[in-house]
């Protein structure tokens, strides 16, 4: 009597990454009968939602439904109709919403409530929208890259999937940079994790992992820039801010109310004798770098060693995948090659920041000016964060791999989040059936 279409032998999952600056929808696909195998889930689509992050809809929540429409409709096109009702949808909001919640729990709840109602209107298996913790964001990013690199597989391969893949089972560390926060996650070498908040224990595929993670709220590239501006305007003699992190000839008017809108600038807030100020770029990498370092408090550390702001950081260990804005910024600056040393990166940043704004605009005519203007700051910030913040050195720089995608899937927390929520990463090593992995035969 039932004529419900037989499901394909594949399954799908949807994760929306509601970041501080924008929302992206990811569609994943995997063979139904190999759910517990490592490395079988892959991304089939990414849809970037037009507009800002969801936290910006706080005064216009009625627009959230329309905002999400195009990408949700794209999901309906990509995923076969017969699979829609069985396809889980998860939305995870990150630091932009963490900041909104700090300002007002009620407003954050209202935004999430409208997001939930909008997403539940689609014919998918909507599983909820929530603000994930910084610890989760770090952990899921670490799971994603190691899953995609095949680090959880007990089978050793005689070939390499990706150029930077070492043939051992040593996991990669994860470095994630967003607009409002940044995460560092890795397995330290025989080192006690001195602060319980930064310690994670996983048992994955029959192996135990003791993982260090920390998320630095307000140290994503956008919030770090707001912090720097708020810090620097304190000592400006008038409403002109001569800023070394912007190209010579660049000018932009900033509202003081916008500057102090974010909780990230509260520590620098003061009454200013003007409502607006003008940034005037002077394009000096060294001075920009120095200004950024003032955002990192390294004078206090209650542990054997710290990153900054009194946060414990064990000695760096092994290779690291640096993704999200670490990758996008360095890719734009053409600095993602494994062959580019830290000294060369610094040299190129000096040249880039010193280029006149008019010249930059001509060279990159297709790039939105808002983004284009901030690459000097962002590139300098990445160097400062990695070198002085996380204590990478010229030598250990070669262990940082700037990664956009691995095997066609974006590096980021979303895949790890879905793998966890769909119970696709078993604690124990599944019993493999003969010839189930054609690659290994």
């Amino acid at each position: 009597t039932q004529n419900k279409a037989l499901p394909e032998n594949v399954k799908y999952g949807i994760v929306l990454d509601a970041g501080s600056s924008h929302t992206s929808l990811y569609i994943y696909k995997w063979p139904a009968e190999k759910e517990n195998d490592t490395g079988v889930v892959h991304q089939v689509e990414e849809c970037r939602v037009k507009g800002p992050g969801i936290s910006k809809f706080v005064q216009k929540v009625n627009e959230i439904g329309i905002y999400l429409t195009d990408c949700m409709e794209r999901a309906r096109e990509v995923i076969p109709r017969s699979q829609h009702q069985e396809t889980p949808v998860y939305l995870g909001a990150t630091a932009g919403m963490r900041l909104l919640r700090m300002e007002s729990e009620e407003l954050a709840d209202r935004v999430l409530d409208v997001v939930e109602r909008s997403l539940s209107n689609y014919p998918f298996d909507f599983q909820g929208a929530r603000i994930i913790t910084g610890q989760e964001e770090g952990a899921y990013g670490w799971i994603t890259i190691n899953y995609l690199l095949g680090k959880f597989s007990q089978k050793t391969r005689w070939f390499s999937i990706v150029p930077y893949e070492t043939n051992n089972q040593e996991t990669f560390g994860a470095l994630d940079l967003g607009g409002a926060s940044t995460q560092v996650t890795f397995v330290p070498q025989n080192q006690t994790i001195e602060s319980p908040d930064n310690a994670l224990q996983f048992r994955l595929y029959g192996k135990d992992y003791n993982v260090y993670t920390h998320s630095f709220l307000c140290y994503g590239k956008d919030q770090a820039l707001w912090q720097k501006l708020a810090k620097d305007i304190q000592v400006a003699s008038n409403e002109i801010l001569r800023d070394p992190c912007f190209h010579p000839g660049y000018k932009k008017v900033v509202n003081v109310s916008d500057l102090y809108k974010t909780p990230c600038t509260k520590r620098f807030e003061m009454t200013l004798p003007f409502q607006q100020f003008e940034i005037q770029g002077i394009g000096n990498y060294q001075q920009c770098h120095q200004s950024i370092l003032e955002l990192f408090n390294t004078s206090y550390c209650p542990y054997s060693q710290c990153a900054f702001n009194g946060i414990f950081l064990p000695p760096l260990q092994g290779d690291f995948g640096a993704f999200s804005a670490f990758y996008f910024v360095m890719k734009f600056l053409n600095l993602t090659s494994e062959k580019v040393s830290q000294e060369k990166v610094t040299e190129m940043m000096k040249k880039f920041c010193a280029q006149p704004w008019e010249e930059i605009k001509t060279s990159y005519a297709g790039v939105k000016e808002k983004y284009l203007s901030e690459y000097c700051f962002s590139g300098t910030y990445i160097l400062s964060l990695l070198l002085q913040g996380y204590h990478f050195t010229a030598d250990s720089w070669e262990h940082i791999h700037f990664i956009g995608k691995i095997q066609g899937s974006d590096a980021g927390w979303t895949l790890g989040y879905m793998l966890n929520l769909t119970n696709m990463i078993p604690a124990e090593q599944p019993l493999s059936t003969p010839l189930s992995h054609s690659t290994y035969v």
Epitope: T1, N3, K4, A5, R81, H84, Q85, P123, D125, F126
Partner: antibody
Framework: EVKLEESGGGLVQPGGSMKLSCVAS????????MNWVRQSPEKGLEWVAE??????????HYAESVKGRFTISRDDSKNNVYLQMNNLRPEDTGIYYC????????????WGAGTTVTVSS | DIVMTQSPAILSVTPGDRVSLSCRAS??????LHWYQQKSHESPRLLIK???QSISGIPSRFSGSGSGSNFTLSINSVEPEDVGVYFC?????????FGAGTKLELR
Amino acid sequence: EVKLEESGGGLVQPGGSMKLSCVASGFTFSKYWMNWVRQSPEKGLEWVAEIRLKSNKYGTHYAESVKGRFTISRDDSKNNVYLQMNNLRPEDTGIYYCTTQLDLYWFFDVWGAGTTVTVSS
Amino acid sequence: DIVMTQSPAILSVTPGDRVSLSCRASQSISDYLHWYQQKSHESPRLLIKYASQSISGIPSRFSGSGSGSNFTLSINSVEPEDVGVYFCQNGHSLPLTFGAGTKLELR
């Protein structure tokens, strides 16, 4: 045989309440989204409410005209779906059909015979 | 909400005629359009799903076409038992909405 059977209709005064029931047979009830659709000479066919599955946390959706007044619910152990109607208005008068979709979603390949609700003083 | 508009409201036919019933959506709904037949004193019955997909048990003289916002239900040789009201339905997004119907009657 796949079958839906509604009950609970009748005459009710404006502002009153009424609960409609629908019992399903011939298919695995707990696996399918259930709906109520009504029909009146004035408004024609009108979708009223939908309830999804346990795995969807029994998510519900309503037509704007009944939101806040009507509640759809289900009892998978009894193969029943219900429509609790409060603060009834004359414009709620009509034949109420229990419907489902055994094949995919958002169309109705199984309909009950309907139960008539009259809201009048 | 997506508004479904059907035309004509009434269609008088002779057995053996080929007829076309029209349905227009107020916005694009891809192929998420379904057709129903309702005979006097009966519940509606699904005729066509997803604009053109046939339903088992429905005579092959019924066919559907269209995509986006314009759709057509065709009956290639009308039989006397086809008398009734034909409704189209938006199955694209909530709220699900129906057209007002086309009444098919014999001349």
